[in-house]
């Protein structure tokens, strides 16, 4: 249960800017790039680079654009119909199971293992045992430390790849 991180919205932004385009809702909904007015009569456009909506909606205000964290690069900017796309910087990755921050990729595999997968923005390097071909799981000491581990003893648990 603690893994479920949620975010409540901040106070709605004021939407009275005269330059915002308006159109009529369709079946009570507004198209991507718009939100609905409080009286439900108008669709008001989102502000480019500030907020967005990606689907037909009855939102009273558009959603705030994501700002990329330090350690991330912006792949594509926020538009009125699409949120910012951020990606971990080269040499770092973000796992689905621990998505809060970009983590540094390992620089090499432990003794007795070979690298079969490179560091990507969404995955660490992948190591397998030379002989058995089983995949390495869990934390791995730095390459320098693995040299000192006992022969035949893996530095951390291994599991069958599947």
């Amino acid at each position: 249960e603690s893994a479920l991180i949620t975010q409540q919205d901040l106070a709605p932004q004021q939407r009275a800017a005269p330059q915002q385009k308006r159109s009529s809702p369709s079946e009570g909904l507004c198209p991507p790039g718009h939100h609905i007015s409080e009286d439900g009569r108008d669709c008001i456009s989102c502000k480019y680079g500030q907020d967005y909506s990606t689907h037909w909606n009855d939102l009273l205000f558009c959603l705030r654009c994501t700002r990329c964290d330090s350690g991330e690069v912006e792949l594509s900017p926020c538009t009125t119909t699409r949120n910012t796309v951020c990606q971990c910087e080269e040499g770092t990755f973000r796992e689905e199971d621990s998505p809060e921050m970009c983590r540094k990729c390992r620089t090499g595999c432990p003794r007795g293992m070979v690298k079969v997968g490179d560091c990507t923005p969404w995955s660490d390097i992948e190591c397998v045992h030379k002989e058995s071909g089983t995949k390495h799981s869990g934390e791995v000491p730095a390459v320098e430390e693995t040299v000192t581990s006992s022969p035949g003893t893996p530095a951390s648990p291994c599991s069958l790849s599947g």
Epitope: L4, T6, Q8, D9, H35, N57, L59, L63, E100
Partner: nanobody, 125 residues
Amino acid sequence: EVQLLESGGGLVQPGGSLRLSCAASVSTFGTSPVGWFRQAPGKEREFVSAIRWDGVGAYYADSVKGRFTISRDNSKNTLYLQMNSLRAEDTAVYYCALPRRGDSELPSTVKEYGYWGQGTLVTVS
């Protein structure tokens, strides 16, 4: 542990209606956006609708716009999907889902969701 249990599916004639429910056993349900997805036989799971944490405002897929309505009751930790004017192409297993992280106010892609129910089958025939 996060548990989501869908109900309300069944067999319905074209043009008919169904109301799906999703009961959540997680204390943070009332502070999280939540969504409905569906998966037809042989097809990928697709977004149907998602609703804000406070129930004020929702997203709808083009294919269900004007026919489906999402709602929630945070006091009961329950999500609903009212489906009207059902069509044969709405036949699918319907899943409710909670996002895995809180960086999006209203997630609408499968990868943004990490907690899934077992699904309830809706057959329109």
